[in-house]
């Protein structure tokens, strides 16, 4: 996209702070205002950027999902982190949901790691 | 609310040319405008945009080919030296923000473009 | 340039049946695409923003999800209107990014 001097539908609440660009772009916390004079802040606990950006917005906070739970907020430079609830975890196939950890390992084998945020629990066989 | 555009016409190739997108029951102040074509047959190709203060960009591959600018109540598609390969539709479309996301939720008609010799 | 890759470029599907389209980023656009259906003779019409949210007036049959670089429109029981053809675009959410459509998909019902 090329610029060749934007939108009250869109314009900076008072609060928000702002400054100038530098080589177009605005820092970590901030977005670009349309007419590429400004950058203007994030919106704490609402958006964020976590990179020197062009960006005409900040990136929306993401919420956590019913099964999981908040580990760290959004601030204006970071989005929240969830983790899935205790008992349950996400795997790297499906990280949309979370899923129950099992109870127990199968006749036959034993338990050698419990159920984490990010992992089923493991089972090993037993030794004869 | 709407959005027309006019202007459309059989040009001869580098004859420089002039689309009007007029728009009525809102103010240009408010919103911000994109220009897109269609070849016959083909798909959609974005030219550019006109912020609601004025500025202007444009694709990467439209830089130069093309000029945008308003008035309070139209926005003007110029195409500066046309060849063959404008032959199209052209589409003003009106984009809306979302809070998150901008997206053009109305459009014209079209107007269609010939250039041959 | 930013290059916005639709798939398939057309579908054929019976009445009450389902229809995705893919549509692939050259870089990430986080969730800034739009979705777009157009029949011959007609402007496009918007069918859904950022990513997944409906349009004015456009039914719930339709829907989008994905991320980043991969997005996917959806059109479950399907009707003989849905016949047309399907774009996707990246929304303008940056100074230096186009805001390119996909090839479009042709949408056939039988």
């Known amino acids: 996209i090329t610029r060749q001097s934007l939108d009250p539908q869109r314009r900076a609440a008072p609060q928000q702070k702002r400054s100038s660009p530098t080589e177009g772009l605005c820092p970590p916390g901030h977005h670009i205002s349309e007419d590429s004079r400004e950058c203007i802040s994030c919106k704490y606990g609402q958006d964020y950027s976590t990179h020197w950006n062009d960006f005409l917005f900040c990136l929306r906070c993401t919420k956590c999902d019913s099964g999981e739970v908040e580990v760290n907020s959004c601030t204006t430079t970071r989005n929240t982190v969830c983790q899935c609830e205790e008992g349950t975890f996400r795997e790297e196939d499906s990280p949309e949901i979370c899923r129950k950890c099992r109870t127990g390992c199968p006749r036959g084998m034993v338990k050698v790691k419990d159920c984490t945020p990010w992992s089923d629990i493991e089972c090993v066989h037993k030794e004869s | 609310q709407s959005v027309e555009e006019s202007g459309g016409r059989l040009v001869t190739p580098g004859t420089p040319l002039t689309l009007t997108c007029t728009v009525s029951?809102?103010?240009?102040?408010?919103?911000?405008m994109s220009w897109v074509r269609q070849a016959p047959g083909k798909g959609l190709e974005w030219i550019g945009i006109?912020?609601?203060?004025?500025t202007t960009y444009y694709a990467s591959w439209a830089k130069g080919r093309f000029t945008i600018s308003k008035t309070s109540t139209t926005v003007d598609l110029k195409v500066t030296s046309p060849t063959t390969e404008d032959t199209a539709t052209y589409f003003c479309?009106?984009?809306?923000?979302?809070?998150?996301?901008?997206?053009?939720?109305?459009w014209g008609p079209g107007t269609l473009v010939t250039v041959s010799s | 340039a930013l290059v916005m890759t639709q798939t398939p470029s057309s579908v054929s599907a019976a009445v009450g049946g389902t229809v995705t389209i893919n549509c692939q980023a050259s870089?990430?656009?986080?969730?800034?695409l739009a979705w777009f259906q157009q029949k011959p003779g007609q402007p496009p019409k918007l069918l859904i923003y950022?990513?997944?949210k409906l349009a004015s007036g456009v039914p719930s049959r339709f829907s989008g999800s994905g991320s980043g670089t991969e997005f996917t429109l959806t059109i479950s029981d399907l009707e003989c209107d849905d016949a047309a053809t399907y774009y996707c675009?990246?929304?303008?959410?940056?100074?230096?990014?186009?805001?390119?459509f996909g090839g479009g998909t042709e949408v056939v019902v039988k």
């Open positions: 479309a009106r984009e809306t923000y979302y809070g998150y996301s901008y997206a053009a939720g109305l």
């Open positions: 675009q990246s929304s303008w959410h940056s100074i230096s990014t186009d805001c390119a």
């Open positions: 950022e990513t997944s």
């Open positions: 006109i912020s609601s203060s004025g």
């Open positions: 029951g809102f103010s240009l102040s408010n919103y911000a």
């Open positions: 870089q990430n656009i986080y969730s800034n």
